[in-house]
Structure formats: structure tokens, C-alpha cells
């Protein structure tokens, strides 16, 4: 189970001194800022027990594995459900604390009830302040049952829940009909997913027999030990005032764990710390009792004395929970409660035993979860103990579970179960990511998702040129930082792979999938210069340039011409894809615009130095369109066009251009020049009879202007096929034939 404890300080004289602390003993817990450990979350859960809104509670992080909630201003702030979430991935676990108001009308005899599937649960609400009205029971905020106030038994209202199933788990409450919801008795029911003493998907596996009030987890078979106890079966007591899966945490304050409620992952729930009891965990255990909530009885034999924190303290020559075992009986010594190995390793496991007669190599054996018995390959005999060493065959995942070391002599036997966790070395699920590249280096993010088990101890980056048979180069990196691969060859593809490792022998995982990363080309170094340019129209510019002569091949793929229109703040880029090119025609420019022009050599995606800039002014655009164009058929081969001059001319017109096209025809249009700009009429001759034509025209000054409207007209009928249109103009004002 996840090593997560939610502590509630129950010294309730002043709510402002109340605090909740969530402590994680997990490696890397709560760091949050990196990908390997999400943060601890501690919050009030208002989904079921709704309380009046108050000032926001203050959350303070104390180091990486502890978070504290303060800022309670009035007693009603405390009432309700609080939760702490910790652990990563599939191990993410929520620990819940339920707080009851000491002044409530109804109080729970016991807040947390952990029961097995199929059991009958009985919740008991004690009358603290009587009201002669209905008592309503709720489950997870919804109506569940009603009792009449006459139905109290010995001053208690009981809710019997027969044959409970896991979905029955949750927050229950008992409330008088006319009382504030804050005056309710709140309970937490935890229903294990299996019957008593069983665990696993089909509840087929047997629990290890948790001691000292530990509860067997229905998913993984581990004992969730009460605060103050440790070991695979909770067989070992911590020193007074300590808690956590390895007794690594210490209760705050001078009075140790007095006044603190401890909440642990389900199916344990909450209790006082070892040696304390009562609704506020302020009462020491009565003589002969010990453990969390003082629920355990010592029953010490052979002169043992009862310690309220650890149970029986045995005199010399005796051991066992009740000092019932003579030291003549062999005893397993200092066996770790949990061991971790990596998949497919062949670890050595040691098991030490003492006793009288002294255990020898053959009297100590190791039993795997599948029942296989291993005999020790060697034993180290010391004056006070014998240590047997076992060479374990290559581990498979099925070896995860409870192993047992057993010693047997004529004096008796002893055994110690311990948990073996077989971990899968991590394997990257994705390739590393390329962040930036240069000609001789690649910047890579090695952080990838992975299958298998963490924590990640080292990350190796392997790389070599693509299609190469040479050895891989390897670099060991920090998983949270980007890596720069240096001294690479330009314009070369590199195969790059990640390998992750977890702690312990054989913790290196398989290499992740490769990815191809290509270095950039060498940067082009030559600076071109502009030889010249000339305008080929209002929107066309021809540019020429040169390069300095240098020995060796030209490093470059082509040229980039840049035109900067400062007035509009626009840049035009023209790519010339031949490195041999020294001239280019730029079209589609804006007439009448002042451009800044430069050219630079490029190679792959890299640009060389730009030429010194040149300043170019394009002439303005052509004139506006002629106005009121009109067509009139004169005969079967002639059509007369008339128009008016364009308005607001920027200069004298040099000519007009007429466009002639057969309506609906697929051929190219014909352009006819009208070279006398003063003309406002022309006759188009040589047309076909009975044919519909389209006409439009434009004027030219330094460049061609806009087209006029298009007009349609048909020639008259019964004519012969003409050779093609020609034109005759006249000035309409003068009435002269041209």
C-alpha cells in the first residue's frame, strides 16, 4: 500500500489551532514539478457534507512529502470530510478523514467501520442532545433510512446493514429531522472487496494474517498497519511517537501522538495513534491494553510486562507476541519485511536464525509463493546466529508475493513471511524528442513515457550515424533536463534511442524505439553583392548579383531575394533555387513603390550574410479605364467603337489597346493598338458576318492601365467570311475619316 498518512490535530479548544497534515513516505512523493511524482493534494471535500462557506483554508507545503491545511476560524469549518491524495499512477491513493462536531446532537460511537464483504455492519449514533423527532440516516448524501425517536436503544440509534457489499462503502450520517446538518453523526464505512482473510481478484488468495490490528488489503494482500506498527504482518512496534510504514515519521509536539487522529489508506481507515484512545485521542490506554485506539490486549506470559505502545516486553529467555516462546525455540532474526528485485535477475536472499540447538544450513529453507522450496547454497555460522544464503532462480512476475523463511530444529520451529516485489525495468514507449539542431549538434528532450516500474534512477541516450555499424555512443543524463549531443557531423542523420533504468541489479530496461535526427548543413559564408537592376514595367524588376570567387565547391543551394516595402511594412521573398543563377525577374510588384532590396545565399535551412541593400523605386501604375465604351455594327464586317477619355490622368496617354474576342469562343483574344491617343472612336474591320463579338479597351501611359467595361455587338448578316479584324480610327469630335 502507499505510505500515506493523514493526521488530524484534535485539540479542539480553539479551532484556529486545528490543523490537518498529510505525510507521504513514498520516494519522490509530492515533488510535483517533474514527471516522476504528482503533488500531494489535501482538501475539504464538500460533495457529501456541505458546510456554510467560510474564508479559504490555507495550504502549506513543508518539504517534498508533507502538506498542512490550516485557517479554520470556527468549529463548523471542521465538520465534514477531508481527503489527501498521494502516490503516482496506478498507486495514486486517497486517504479520508471524517470530522464530527463534539457539540453535535448525535455522536458516532465509532467513526470508521471496516468490514468484510458479506458481513453485517452496525453503525451506532449516541444521543448527545435529545430531540423528540425523527432521525434520518443518509448514505453518501442521499436519504437512506428513518428511525422514530422512540426507537433509540440505550440512548443510541442503530443502523444495521446486513450482507454489505463494496458499493455500500461511503459516508453515512444520522441527523435529527429538525437539527442542523452540522449536528449530525458522521461515519465512514469501508467494505473490503473480499470475505475475511481473503484477497485477490477472485478472493482466492489467503491474507498473511495481519497482527496488531493491521488490515489485509483486498487488492494486493498487503497488511495496512496501524500507526506505530511496521513489518509485512505489522509484527514490529515502532518506538513511541513514531509512525509510517518504516516508522520513519515522528509525531509533532512534546506530547507525542496524543490528540492526533491517524488516517491511512483503505481498508484501514482512521484511528488514534498507538497508546491512545477516546473520541479526541487524548486518553492513555488502560492497563493491559495497547496499540491504536487501545484495541489490543497484552495477555503477557512468563513475566512479560505490558507497554501501551508496543505490547508485551519479554524478560530474558522469552519472545513472541505474549512472551509465550522460549528462546530455546529457534527464531528467525532481522528478516526484512519487504524485498524488491528486478525481473529476470537471480538475487541472493539471506535468512538468519538463532536457537538452541543451534540451527545449521539444512535446517533453514526458503519457500516461494507457488510452494517451491529452495535450500540454501551456503551458510555462515557465527556465535549468535546462522545465516543461510539462497540463490534464487531467474525471477518471473509470478514470484511477486509472500515468501517464507522457515527454520526447524529439535527445539521447535519458526517462520517469517516477507513480501517480494518483482519489478519490471522501465522501457520507453516513445522516442526522444528533437528540440533544436545545428550543423554539429542536436538538442534532445530525453523525457518520455514508459512501461514498467519506476522510479527512474538513470537515463541513457544512445546515438550513432544512421545506417552505421559503428558502436553506439552513450551519454548518461538527468531525466529532467534537455541534452545536447555535441561534435556531430553536419548534414548527417543520427539514430537516437533512450534507455531507462530503475534502482537495483538488473534494473536496466530495454532500449526504446529509435528516432532519426538530422544535423543541419554547414552555414553558407559567402556574401553576394547586387550588380544592378532595371525596371521592366510598373510591376516588374530584373535583378542581377555576383559572388566572390573562392577555391573549392560552392556551399549553397540557391539564393533568397528580399524586397522590403517600408511604407506598408511588408516583405516579399523570392526563392531562386539554383546556386549558379546570377539574375532573376521579380514580377507582381506594387507600382509606384519604394523597395529595399537584398540577396543572400542559402544552404538547407540556413541563410548566409545578406548583400548590402539597394533602394529601388518602381514607376507608378497605368491610367484609369476609358469611360462609356460603346459598340455599333456598321456592316456585316465592321463594328464602330466609341468612348470617352479616362479621368484624372497622371500624364499624357501614349496609346489605347482594344481587345476583340468572339463571344463564347475558345481562342485567345486579339489586341489592337490605337496609336493616336486623342482618338475617341475607331472602326474594327474584317469581322465575320452574323457574329457576336466582345470588346474592351485600356489606355497606356508608362504602363498599361485598367480595362474598361466589356461591350457586346453582332455584325450584320449575309456577308462573306472575312480575313480577320483590322481597325480604322477617327476623332469623333472632328468627324474626320482616318
Amino acid at each position: 500500500a502507499v505510505d500515506l498518512t493523514l493526521l488530524a490535530n484534535l485539540r479542539l479548544t480553539d479551532p484556529q489551532r486545528f490543523f490537518l497534515t498529510c505525510v507521504s513516505g513514498e520516494a519522490g512523493a509530492g515533488r510535483g514539478s517533474d514527471a516522476w511524482g504528482p503533488p500531494l493534494l489535501l482538501e475539504k471535500d464538500d460533495r457529501i457534507v456541505r458546510t456554510p462557506p467560510g474564508p479559504p483554508l490555507r495550504l502549506a507545503r513543508n518539504g517534498s512529502h508533507q502538506v498542512t491545511l490550516r485557517g479554520f476560524s470556527k468549529p463548523s469549518d471542521l465538520v465534514g470530510v477531508f481527503s489527501c491524495v498521494g502516490g503516482a499512477g496506478a498507486r495514486r491513493t486517497r486517504v479520508i478523514y471524517v470530522h464530527n462536531s463534539p457539540g453535535a446532537h448525535l455522536l458516532p460511537d465509532k467513526v470508521t467501520h471496516t468490514v468484510n464483504k458479506g458481513d453485517t455492519a452496525v453503525l451506532s449514533a449516541r444521543v448527545h442532545k435529545e430531540k423528540q423527532t425523527d432521525v434520518i440516516w443518509k448514505s453518501n448524501g442521499s436519504y437512506f433510512y428513518t428511525l422514530d425517536w422512540h426507537e433509540a436503544q440505550d440512548g443510541r440509534f442503530l443502523l444495521q446493514l446486513p450482507n454489505v457489499q463494496p458499493p455500500s462503502s461511503g459516508i453515512y450520517s444520522a441527523t435529527y429531522l429538525e437539527a442542523s446538518p452540522l449536528g449530525s453523526a458522521f461515519f465512514r464505512l469501508i467494505v473490503r472487496g473480499c470475505g475475511a482473510g481473503r484477497w485477490g481478484p477472485g478472493c482466492t488468495k489467503e491474507c498473511p494474517g495481519c497482527l496488531h490490528g493491521g488490515v489485509c488489503h483486498d487488492h494486493d494482500g498487503e497488511c495496512v498497519c496501524p500507526p506505530g506498527f511496521t513489518g509485512t504482518r505489522c509484527e514490529q512496534a515502532c518506538r513511541e511517537g513514531r509512525f509510517g510504514q518504516s516508522c520513519q515519521e515522528q509525531c509533532p509536539g512534546i506530547s507525542g501522538c496524543r490528540g492526533l487522529t491517524f488516517c491511512l489508506p483503505d481498508p484501514y481507515g482512521c484511528s488514534c495513534g498507538s497508546g491512545w484512545r477516546g473520541s479526541q485521542c487524548q486518553e492513555a490506554c488502560a492497563p493491559g491494553h495497547f496499540g491504536a485506539d487501545c484495541r489490543l490486549q497484552c495477555q503477557c506470559q512468563n513475566g512479560g510486562t505490558c507497554d501501551r505502545f508496543s505490547g508485551c516486553v519479554c524478560p530474558s529467555g522469552w519472545h513472541g507476541v505474549h512472551c509465550e516462546k522460549s528462546d530455546r525455540i529457534p527464531q528467525i532474526l532481522n528478516m526484512a519485511s519487504e524485498l524488491e528485485f528486478n525481473l529476470e535477475t537471480m538475487p541472493r536472499i539471506n535468512c538468519a536464525a538463532a536457537g538452541n540447538p543451534f540451527p545449521v544450513r539444512g535446517s533453514i529453507e526458503l519457500r516461494k509463493p507457488d510452494g517451491t522450496v529452495l535450500l540454501s547454497t551456503k551458510a555462515i555460522v557465527e556465535p549468535e546466529k546462522t545465516t543461510a544464503e539462497f540463490e534464487v532462480p531467474r525471477l518471473v512476475l509470478a514470484d511477486s508475493g509472500f515468501w517464507e523463511c522457515r527454520v526447524s530444529t529439535s527445539g521447535g520451529q519458526d517462520s517469517r513471511r516477507f513480501k517480494v516485489n518483482v519489478k519490471v525495468p522501465p522501457v520507453p514507449l516513445a522516442a526522444p524528442r528533437l528540440l533544436t539542431k545545428q550543423s554539429r549538434q542536436l538538442v534532445v528532450s530525453p523525457l518520455v513515457s514508459f512501461s514498467g516500474d519506476g522510479p527512474i534512477s538513470t537515463v541513457r541516450l544512445h546515438y550513432r550515424p544512421q545506417d552505421s555499424t559503428m558502436d553506439w555512443s552513450t551519454i548518461v543524463v538527468d531525466p529532467s533536463e534537455n541534452v545536447t549531443l555535441m561534435n556531430l557531423r553536419p548534414k548527417t542523420g543520427y539514430s537516437v534511442r533512450v534507455q531507462l533504468s530503475r534502482p537495483g541489479e538488473g534494473g536496466e530496461g530495454a532500449w526504446g524505439p529509435p528516432t532519426l535526427m538530422t544535423t543541419d548543413c554547414p552555414e553558407p559564408l559567402l556574401q553576394p553583392w547586387l550588380e544592378g537592376w532595371h525596371v521592366e514595367g510598373t510591376d516588374r524588376l530584373r535583378v542581377s548579383w555576383s559572388l566572390p570567387l573562392v577555391p573549392g565547391p560552392l556551399v549553397g543551394d540557391g539564393f533568397l531575394l528580399r524586397l522590403w516595402d517600408g511604407t506598408r511594412g511588408q516583405e516579399r521573398r523570392e526563392n531562386v533555387s539554383s546556386p549558379q543563377a546570377r539574375t532573376a525577374l521579380l514580377t507582381g510588384l506594387t507600382p509606384g513603390t519604394h523597395y529595399q532590396l537584398d540577396v543572400q545565399l542559402y544552404h538547407c535551412t540556413l541563410l548566409g550574410p545578406a548583400s548590402p541593400p539597394a533602394h529601388v523605386l518602381l514607376p507608378p501604375s497605368g491610367p484609369p479605364a476609358p469611360r462609356h465604351l460603346h459598340a455599333q455594327a456598321l456592316s456585316d464586317s465592321e463594328i464602330q467603337l466609341t468612348w470617352k477619355h479616362p479621368e484624372a490622368l497622371p500624364g499624357p496617354i501614349s496609346k489605347y489597346v482594344v481587345e476583340v474576342q468572339v463571344a463564347g469562343g475558345a481562342g485567345d483574344p486579339l489586341w489592337i493598338d490605337v496609336d493616336r491617343p486623342e482618338e475617341t472612336s475607331t472602326i474594327i474591320r474584317g469581322l465575320n458576318a452574323s457574329t457576336r463579338y466582345l470588346f474592351r479597351m485600356r489606355a497606356s501611359i508608362q504602363g498599361l492601365g485598367d480595362w474598361s467595361n466589356t461591350v457586346e455587338e453582332s455584325t450584320l448578316g449575309n456577308g462573306l467570311q472575312a480575313e480577320g479584324p483590322v481597325q480604322e480610327s477617327r476623332a469623333a469630335e472632328e468627324g474626320l475619316d482616318q
Epitope: Y145, T146, L147, D148, L177, E178
Partner: antibody
Framework: EVQLLESGGGLVQPGGSLRLSCAAS????????MQWVRQAPGKGLEWVSS????????YYADSVKGRFTISRDNSKNTLYLQMNSLRAEDTAVYYC???????????????????WGQGTMVTVSS | DIQMTQSPSSLSASIGDRVTVTCRTS??????LNWYQQKPGQAPNLLIY???SLESGVPSRFSGSGSGTDFTLTISSLQPEDFATYYC?????????FGRGTTLEIQ
Amino acid sequence: EVQLLESGGGLVQPGGSLRLSCAASGFTFSIYKMQWVRQAPGKGLEWVSSIYPSGGATYYADSVKGRFTISRDNSKNTLYLQMNSLRAEDTAVYYCARQTYYYDSSGYFRNAFDIWGQGTMVTVSS
Amino acid sequence: DIQMTQSPSSLSASIGDRVTVTCRTSQSIDTYLNWYQQKPGQAPNLLIYGASSLESGVPSRFSGSGSGTDFTLTISSLQPEDFATYYCQQSYTTSYTFGRGTTLEIQ
């Protein structure tokens, strides 16, 4: 569908007895407080009796106390009203009703009769 | 027992009218008051619980108010289906007393 269905009504002579039944369906009958309410012809509603989910507590209107007995069988999802020493003034349509608890806006509980049967007519006449 | 005084006993109104029915109790019942609607030949139907909370599925033109001893049921704009008899009921004590009813008729 949540439903209550009364039966057992009919014509009975003064001093006689009758047992009404109310069959519940569509909800968990065993967790609800149940009621009998009656309505004399052309008159208003009159609460008669109530019973708690366990059957361990019952209440009666003064007008029927000592003569009527409310009971329930949670295994059969059925509510009963045993009526003895019947009088002409007991003539009425008898409804069974489910009592539900609601939250009001301040989080306090309020109770009301949210599901009613269609009623069964009891006529006491010689 | 708590006495319930409901007024008026009958009331004529037109469609679209705003109608108010009042209920007074002989002692304070906080907001433990419910309103029911009953149409001829049918069982009563819960409209409002806790003096002012609308039962789900009941149109929003119905509203309730009051606390202590004086309570009001208001229909903001009468609809044809609203012509029925309305009862108040106290749920403060276990003898759940009803008012005598108010019959709402079409004018």
C-alpha cells in the same frame, strides 16, 4: 415506475372489520416511512396513521386510535391497515402515501408525502 | 394537535390571473409546511415542500412562502390545468394535519 396500489376496500356494516393493503413497486420500500390518509366524500384530506421503516414505531390520529392498526411486511413490499369497530364516519377513500425527506436551501431536512396511491373506497353502512 | 386554517375555502379566477391561497397554523412550525393539489377523482399531488421548495416536475408558476405560522401559495399566471383543490399540510409533528382545502374555480 414508482407506484402504490391500494386494495381491500368495500362495503362493511358498522362494527365490522376490513383490512386494506398497499403494494409498493419501483422503489426500496423497506427504507421509507409510510402513511395512510383518507378523504370522506366531498370533504378534505385527513391523516390517519404512519409507520416507520422498521415497523418499530407507529402513530395514529385520535379519531382511529385503538380501532385501527398499521403494519408492514418489508419482504413483500406491502403496507396494511387493519380497521376494526368501523363507524359510518370512517366512510372515505383511503390513500397510502410514501413519506420522503428533502433538503431545503439551508441544508435542513423537510418531509412530505411525495408518492400517493389511487385510493380504495371504504363504505360503512347498514 | 396543530390546527390549520386555510383561506379562502373557494375562489373564482380567470386564466392568466395571479392567485394567492393562505394557510395559518395554531403554533409555529418553522417551515415544515407542504402544499398539495388534488383534481376530482384523483389522488393528491405534492407541489411544494418546506414552505417554499418546488417539487421536481412542478411548473415554476407555483411558489410558496412563509415561516412560523403564516404561509402563502401563489400561482403567478393561472393555466386551465390549475383549476383544482389545494391543501396545506404541516409536517412538524407526527400527526400530519391538513388544511380544509381551497377550491379554485373558473370564473
